[in-house]
Interface confidence: low
């Protein structure tokens, strides 16, 4: 039985040209995390494999940094980065857990006057 839950940063906003950290945390389970995939819609951004370390998709190599931890740092943000991001935890023996984060990239003037979303 899958008892775990994924905690995420939920809905977040960041300034165009800036950076953001995407974080998920798996709790309430003793299952072993074998791999975490980070995806944006249908695109694989990065993989963190427990044995083999990080792999980042070539299209994002220059703008995505691994970490901190199992999180992912997006750099040089553009408005096109707005959208849903998913952390997919592959665990043994539970199986797969998925967390969702919505990122909105704002023009500088909007970001300066406060984000539209609050981090839970």
């Amino acid at each position: 039985m899958m008892t775990g839950t994924i905690e995420t940063t939920g809905n977040i906003s960041a300034e165009k040209g800036g950076s953001i950290i995407l974080q998920c945390h798996l709790s309430s389970t003793t299952a072993q995390v074998t791999q975490v995939n980070w995806e944006q819609q249908d695109q694989l951004l990065a993989i963190c494999n427990a044995d083999l370390g990080w792999h980042i998709s070539p299209s994002f190599k220059d703008r995505v940094a691994p970490g901190p931890g199992l999180g992912l740092t997006l750099q040089s943000l553009t408005v096109n980065d707005t959208g849903e991001y998913f952390c997919i935890y592959h665990t043994y023996p539970d199986g797969t857990y998925t967390g969702r984060i919505f990122l909105e990239v704002l023009e500088s003037s909007v970001a300066e006057h406060g984000a539209r979303f609050q981090i839970p």
Partner: antibody, heavy 115, light 107 residues
Framework: EVKLVESGGGLVQPGGSLRLSCATS????????MSWVRQPPGKALEWLAL??????????EYSASVKGRFTISRDNSQSILYLQMNTLRAEDSATYYC??????WGQGTTLTVSS | DIQMTQSSSYLSVSLGGRVTITCKAS??????LAWYQQKPGNAPRLLIS???SLETGVPSRFSGSGSGKDYILSITRLQTEDVATYYC?????????FGSGTKLEIK
């Protein structure tokens, strides 16, 4: 559905030029790295050139075998990838594939360089 | 440039058997390795990226392993549709070089 369709292959004399095209659909073209790969008859795959995505300034990279002779480019308004090939040699004869980051390939177009 | 060496050009395996195809890089590629399957007259098909991550729709009989410079593609319970040529490719640094290919045949 992601689609990549190459065209422009044919028979060319040594020293000649040709431009290959790769028409794409089903994805946001500007978000992706695009590459050209070739395969001579009965031989292995050879990576030729790469053009990065919008976020990375559409910069290019080439293999030593084609650098200075081939030019990769993209028409982002029409979602088309190009490979301009100059000073063609017999050893350039191959099936040419365009490929998108993420493992999507076209079916290829064949170039024969012969007199 | 990073050279990719597939030591076996041909492998002959019995139906239902297990095969491992090896690929060695001339330098560390940090698991930025892809495996492709190509059947005659067809474009290559991506099986595995990131050394271990199976692409959607690829049977679980296929698996990838390795690290550093040495990588392996394993196929278990070999089936007739697995007859093909298999290529590794590194994409750690340009040029994104391919191995010379390993042709898999049924014994």
């Amino acid at each position: 559905e992601v689609k990549l369709v190459e065209s422009g292959g044919g028979l060319v004399q040594p020293g000649g030029s040709l431009r290959l095209s790769c028409a794409t659909s089903g994805f946001t073209f500007t978000d992706y790295y695009m590459s050209w790969v070739r395969q001579p008859p009965g031989k292995a795959l050879e990576w030729l050139a790469l053009i990065r995505n919008k976020a990375n300034g559409y910069t290019t990279e080439y293999s030593a075998s084609v650098k200075g002779r081939f030019t990769i480019s993209r028409d982002n308004s029409q979602s088309i990838l190009y490979l301009q090939m100059n000073t063609l040699r017999a050893e350039d004869s191959a099936t040419y594939y365009c490929a998108r980051d993420g493992g999507y390939w076209g079916q290829g177009t064949t170039l024969t360089v012969s007199s | 440039d990073i050279q990719m060496t597939q030591s076996s050009s041909y492998l002959s395996v019995s139906l239902g058997g297990r095969v491992t195809i090896t690929c060695k890089a001339s330098d560390h590629i940090n698991n930025w390795l892809a495996w492709y399957q190509q059947k005659p007259g067809n474009a290559p098909r991506l099986l595995i990226s990131g050394a271990t991550s199976l692409e959607t729709g690829v049977p679980s009989r296929f698996s990838g392993s390795g690290s550093g410079k040495d990588y392996i593609l394993s196929i278990t319970r070999l089936q007739t549709e697995d007859v093909a040529t298999y290529y590794c490719q590194q994409y750690w640094s340009t040029p994104f070089t391919f191995g010379s290919g390993t042709k898999l045949e049924i014994k």
